[in-house]
């Protein structure tokens, strides 16, 4: 595979990663697929420093990140361990609230207006952030 040594046009480089900030909204799964089409993933926040960087760029707007519990436990989309990793939930979150009347609970995490995290209904059309690592070999599948 090839290596990505600089960020694509319209992406922002920070600490050896590239970030892309949407200007419109999609449901969490559609945002996830959009990032995948970019050979990227929804942003995975691993430190307070990265949290502040993303928060600075998105402003006070609900924005999806790559964290969900649609299959039970909370998981980061890139496999980063949730239990031992960085967290920045709002007080009393996540709460898997069922009172929204949309069916089911809340399985997808987003940045809220103050940057702290909340779980919400995955179908809500929020903005999103894609992330890809520099110098990471792409996994081009073998040709059949």
């Amino acid at each position: 595979g090839s290596e990505r040594t600089c960020c694509p046009v319209n992406w922002v480089e920070h600490e050896r990663s590239c970030y892309w900030f949407s200007r419109s909204g999609k449901a969490w799964a559609d945002a996830d697929n959009y990032c995948r089409l970019e050979d990227a993933h929804l942003v995975v926040v691993t430190s307070w420093e990265e949290q502040k960087f993303v928060q600075h760029h998105i402003g006070p707007v609900n924005t999806w990140m790559g964290l969900h519990d649609q299959n039970g436990p909370w998981k980061w989309v890139d496999g980063t361990d949730y239990e031992t990793g960085f967290k920045n939930w709002r007080p009393e979150q996540p709460d898997d609230w069922y009172g929204h009347g949309l069916g089911g609970g809340e399985d997808c995490a987003h940045f809220t207006d103050d940057g702290r995290w909340n779980d919400d209904v995955c179908q809500r059309p929020y903005r999103w952030v894609c992330e890809t690592e520099l110098d990471k070999a792409s996994q081009e599948p073998p040709l059949l």
């Epitope: 995948r36 089409l37 970019e38 050979d39």
Partner: antibody
Framework: EVQVLESGGGLVQPGGSLRLSCAAS????????MSWVRQAPGKGLEWVSA????????FYTDSVKGRFTISRDNSKNTLYLQMNSLRAEDTAVYYC??????????????WGQGTTVTVSS | DIQMTQSPSSVSASVGDRVTITCRAS??????LAWYQQKPGKAPKLLIY???SLQSGVPSRFSGSGSGTDFTLTISSLQPEDFATYYC?????????FGQGTKVEIK
């Protein structure tokens, strides 16, 4: 000038296999997500599959999942569609298309002339 | 899957006419919509993206509008080369889906 050119179509029996190719020129191929779209005789357009620029992620319409595989060789500027377990309803003109992009991916902005696949006994 | 429904399925018009084609999505897609023109035996051609942005090289008589579920393609003054079939396509969710097409015919 950006161009894509499909090849590999032909007549195949039901249950058979075929591999389509799409050669691209005039673009930075590895930066371009690509797609396959088909059109059955006298019918409308149907999106079939898409692949990210570096080939790490693929997407399919439900009717071809498990039978078709999209792939690419960026060293050869070539896109592929491996079609297995072909059915009569797969008969169509198959188009290769580049996904256009400004801030977002926004549509398929460069199309080939198409290659015809006929599945019949 | 998101269903895209175009209307009318065909329209007869004369050179110079204003032609409007509508496309409705079965669920909201924001402005993730493109319009294509296809002539017989030819590949489709991208006309409009992001619901209302004109693709480079496309004449300004073509315009698009709409957001959410309802979209419109307008040809302000039909030219002889515009007789073709037009398709809308949503790019909000996989699988991407097309409308069934609208054929613009000579009256």
């Amino acid at each position: 000038e950006v161009q894509v050119l499909e090849s590999g179509g032909g007549l195949v029996q039901p249950g058979g296999s075929l591999r389509l190719s799409c050669a691209a020129s005039g673009l930075t191929f590895s930066s371009s997500a690509m797609s396959w779209v088909r059109q059955a005789p006298g019918k409308g357009l149907e999106w079939v599959s898409a692949i990210s620029g570096r080939g790490g992620n693929t997407f399919y319409t439900d009717s071809v999942k498990g039978r078709f595989t999209i792939s690419r060789d960026n060293s050869k500027n070539t896109l592929y569609l491996q079609m297995n377990s072909l059915r009569a309803e797969d008969t169509a003109v198959y188009y290769c298309a580049k996904l256009g992009k400004d801030y977002y991916y926004y549509g398929m902005d460069v199309w080939g002339q198409g290659t015809t696949v006929t599945v019949s006994s | 899957d998101i269903q895209m429904t175009q209307s009318p399925s065909s329209v007869s018009a004369s050179v110079g006419d204003r032609v409007t084609i509508t496309c409705r999505a079965s669920q909201g897609i924001s402005t993730w919509l493109a319009w294509y023109q296809q002539k017989p035996g030819k590949a489709p051609k991208l006309l409009i993206y992001d619901a209302s942005s004109l693709q480079s090289g496309v004449p300004s008589r073509f315009s698009g509008s709409g957001s959410g579920t309802d979209f419109t393609l307008t040809i302000s003054s039909l030219q002889p080369e515009d007789f073709a079939t037009y398709y809308c396509q949503q790019a909000n969710s996989f699988p991407w889906t097309f409308g069934q097409g609208t054929k613009v015919e000579i009256k």
